[in-house]
């Protein structure tokens, strides 16, 4: 029988009446078009909905947009279009919502052809009021808030000017011309690339990387011959053109660009690319594209300086620059990432790592599933997960994998069970232990979301026909109840719940179609009466993350420590609540060779935990360029994995000596870097 249909499933009592009393319909008085939805702040209940409708006329496009606001998590909406003077809002810029709980919103308006600049509407009170501001430039990008100070905004203009505002968009100043890309760093620092000759495209590989730490009063050139740059965790990366040819290399800085080191990564040619897949303050996952149009490359993981890299995964699927990769950080369990590889036979397979890229394996076959037609051996196969690539290929996959940091261990994804990803209609699978084991949760494709930190999972069938039924589970997807939320089915377009998975409200969006018109409609369901009491201590049970062998003293040790969590019992139907904090108890592990990566000049042979010297470097002094100085490395081949907290046990020796020699590693040395002030 399908999951949740056997007799052992405990029914939630009287749920139909409870949900009926907490289902709120809102019909939007618009012609259909497009709709975008944004949450303003955290736990505020404020939602902004922008509907836009385009009518292509012979010589121009006539557009109309409406703005709606809810302050009760979508149960009721008020038309506030008059607050923005009934202006047409440009949807390609979306709604720029300020960081944290600043309550700031910026909407970019469509203006007529001949105007001197663009127009924005600004709110700093969670969209209760808006101020119209005419800009001295036409914006090319959405306004970007400084993560540290939501009053500081930056934007690029259509003429490649870099504009900054220090008073939340009231007054704007152009701080630099000829800018290609700009990003906020930490401490209100702005990094940007500039071109000298023709344009961003023409100067690609000859751009300069600049930094301003005082919002444009003074500048420092921190790099030349730049192709592109990126920020990840505490690392600043730049891909730099080599002197002699058209190849580029990654350089890395951990001091905001004052000093640079060449990353020990392969160089790439014109048609190849680098991509930061994930980064934190400890390390980075870097994808390096293979030469030729292969659609794959190699994942490397960095040391704590972002300089020494270990090969992590071969044949990693990544189609083109800015293309599709399935690389997914499983946020519900530390150290877990899922991605896809392209096999020699061109089939796509899913791989998972539980130790931040140290080792990759196939996903264990779900116990309640059969191997499909892709499997050579009907008893031995794996689960393969559909993610961005499958979605881009228009397979019947409505959603990417889902995990939430406060729903510990839970991962939900579409998948197929065989030797490779199948093009057949997928089912939905769930893991409650961060990806070690999986169970089929729902038959066929579904939209899904996590509420109340995992206390409720909600799903809606993906169908081309109108729908009126929602499914929910209070036991991490084991048993499902169905609820008919409306008598009149709607064409479903999306599920919306407050980011962070702490809410107990879900909004079902769609449209109704009649003979002459179609209208947007939303149904917001509050599950608070299903989870009618607050969870108590007895509702939680102890779980050791990454446990594979209870008899092993090091069971659960990942990156040098293990963590016990308090997890909600599957049988407990109660509210974690909005203030729920994950309870965890870490304990340090003894060091083993698994806690170290291979140092510069060393590598790990397959299926071996020992690091051995690279043959081509045997007997040579290990000298490399670091922060613009020649360094001499004395090592027995090991360096602690970034973020690893192990103590005692194995302790390999390592020493770095400064050779007091200068080296520039194809890059500006600090002495040559120039500064200027406005």
């Amino acid at each position: 029988s399908a999951p949740g249909e056997d007799e052992e499933c405990g029914r939630v009592r009287d749920f139909v009446a409870k949900l009926a009393n907490n289902t709120h319909q809102h019909v939007f008085d618009d012609l259909r078009g497009s709709v975008s939805l944004s949450w303003v702040g955290d736990s505020t209940g404020v939602i902004l909905v922008l509907t836009t409708f385009h009518v292509p006329l012979v010589i121009m496009t006539f557009g109309q947009s409406k703005l709606y606001r809810s302050e009760d998590y979508g149960k009721n909406f008020k038309d506030i279009t008059d607050l923005i003077n009934n202006t047409f809002i440009r949807t390609e810029f979306g709604m720029a919502i300020g960081p944290e709980n600043s309550g700031k919103v910026v909407l970019t308006a469509e203006v007529s052809g001949g105007s001197r600049g663009g127009r924005i509407f600004r709110s700093s009170d969670f969209a209760k009021n808006f101020v119209q501001t005419d800009l001295p430039f036409h914006p090319l990008t959405q306004m970007m808030y400084s993560p540290q100070n939501s009053d500081y905004l930056l934007a690029l203009s259509t003429e490649n000017g870099l504009w900054v505002s220090k008073n939340f968009g009231g007054k704007w100043e152009e701080i630099h011309k000829a800018v290609c890309l700009a990003k906020w760093g930490s401490d209100n620092t702005i990094f940007f690339t500039t071109y000298a000759n023709g344009s961003c495209k023409a100067d690609l590989g000859a751009l300069e990387l600049w930094r301003t730490s005082d919002l444009g009063k003074s500048f420092k050139t921190i790099g030349v011959k730049i192709y592109s740059f990126g920020l990840g965790g505490r690392f600043l990366f730049a891909s730099v053109m080599a002197d002699k040819d058209t190849t580029r290399r990654i350089h890395v800085s951990t001091d905001q660009g004052d000093t640079w080191s060449m990353a020990q990564l392969p160089s790439v040619g014109q048609e190849q690319f680098y991509s930061i897949l994930a980064a934190n303050d400890d390390m980075v996952f870097m994808h390096v594209d293979e030469p030729g149009d292969t659609g794959f490359g190699t994942i490397f993981t960095s040391d704590d300086r972002g300089i020494v890299y270990s090969k992590s995964l071969d044949r990693h699927l990544y189609t083109t620059t800015g293309g599709e990769t399935d690389f997914t950080n499983v946020t519900s369990l530390r150290g877990v990432y899922i991605t896809s590889v392209l096999s020699e036979d061109n089939s796509i397979q899913t791989m998972i790592t539980f130790d931040q890229g140290g080792r990759w394996t196939h996903l264990r076959k779900p116990e309640n599933s059969e191997c499909d037609a892709t499997a050579k051996n009907k008893n031995e196969c794996s689960l393969h997960i559909h993610a961005s690539y499958s979605i881009s290929q228009k397979l019947n996959v409505p959603m990417a994998p889902l995990s939430e940091p406060n729903a510990v261990g839970i991962v939900i994804a579409h998948g197929s069970v065989g030797d490779a990803i199948s093009v057949m209609v997928p089912d939905v699978y769930i893991s409650d232990d961060g990806g070690y084991s999986w169970t089929k949760m729902l038959e066929g494709p579904h939209y899904y979301t996590i509420l109340d930190s995992g206390g409720i999972i909600v799903a809606i069938e993906h169908s081309s026909r109108p729908i009126n039924v929602i499914k929910f589970s209070t036991d991490e997807g084991q048993c499902w109840q169905t609820y008919t939320f409306t008598r009149d089915p709607i064409y479903f377009t999306g599920l919306a719940s407050e980011p962070g998975a702490r809410s107990m409200n879900i909004s079902i969006w769609g449209f109704t179609e009649s003979f002459l018109t179609s209208q947007w409609v939303s149904y917001t369901i509050d599950f608070k009466d299903i989870l009618e009491r607050n969870c108590e201590e007895k509702d939680y049970t102890i779980w050791l993350a990454h446990s594979t062998d209870p008899e092993d003293y090091e069971d659960g040790c990942i990156l040098g420590y293990k963590e016990q969590f308090l997890r909600l019992r599957k049988s407990s139907v109660c509210q974690n609540g909005r203030d729920y904090v994950v309870t965890k108890q870490p304990s340090i592990c003894l060091c083993s060779l698994e806690d170290f990566l291979c140092d510069f000049g060393y590598y790990r042979p397959e299926n071996d935990s020992k690091c051995v010297e690279q043959p081509e470097l045997k007997g040579h002094d290990l000298e490399f360029c670091l922060y613009g100085r020649e360094e001499h490395l004395t090592t027995n081949g090991y360096r602690k994995i970034p973020g690893d907290k192990c103590q005692g046990g194995v302790n390999p020796v390592r020493e770095v000596k400064d050779l007091k020699k200068k080296c520039t590693s194809n890059f500006l040395s600090p002495e040559k870097q120039n500064s200027k002030s406005n």
Epitope: A545, P550, E551, D555, S571, S587
Partner: antibody
Framework: QVQLVQSGAEVKKPGASVKVSCKAS????????MHWVRQAPGQGLEWMGW????????NYAQKFQGRVTMTRDTSISTAYMELSRLRSDDTAVYYC?????????????????WGQGTTVTVSS | DIQMTQSPSSLSASVGDRVTITCRAS??????LNWYQQKPGKAPKLLIY???SLQSGVPSRFSGSGSGTDFTLTISSLQPEDFATYYC?????????FGGGTKVEIK
Amino acid sequence: QVQLVQSGAEVKKPGASVKVSCKASGYTFPGYLMHWVRQAPGQGLEWMGWINPVSGSTNYAQKFQGRVTMTRDTSISTAYMELSRLRSDDTAVYYCARGKRSSGWYEGYGMDVWGQGTTVTVSS
Amino acid sequence: DIQMTQSPSSLSASVGDRVTITCRASQSISSYLNWYQQKPGKAPKLLIYAASSLQSGVPSRFSGSGSGTDFTLTISSLQPEDFATYYCQQSDVSPITFGGGTKVEIK
């Protein structure tokens, strides 16, 4: 092999306290919950609570709340159960028992290793 | 607290007999039910965990079934060493509770 060895029999007066020890060997002591279960003469089994050796956190049955204290010393792989304000109906055999684990889950799978039991007699 | 009701409280059987003991929970406990065997003067011994999983080292003549509220322990062919008291125990919700026991005696 995996075993739990408990301290010897005790005779106590009403109102006194008793502290029973349980030394674990043959397995990773912090890796499992330690439960305490008692059995009055001719009666069934009664669960008293457990201790998590990793954190020292405890879960006591409501009936014993305020009278029972469970502690552990991980350096010597030993768990302790102290019962205070003893009454004559506390006369029983007291068992420590290791909670069986299913990979990461600590509860729900019974108690797979038991101590030999400690007889506590409360009599004036 | 969840009440666990075992039946019968005692039974007489002969070697080779098929013996069935039932256990009912006062509310659903999913599959979080365990069975123990206890002989006089000895500590209990885990036979079945999670309603139907056989603990390692336990003879295959012991089996468990059920989920929700109704559970069964079956001894397919009673052996002389099986004469003992059997307890069910729920571990779904704290506090953990045991059934009153079923004493299996020689007929």
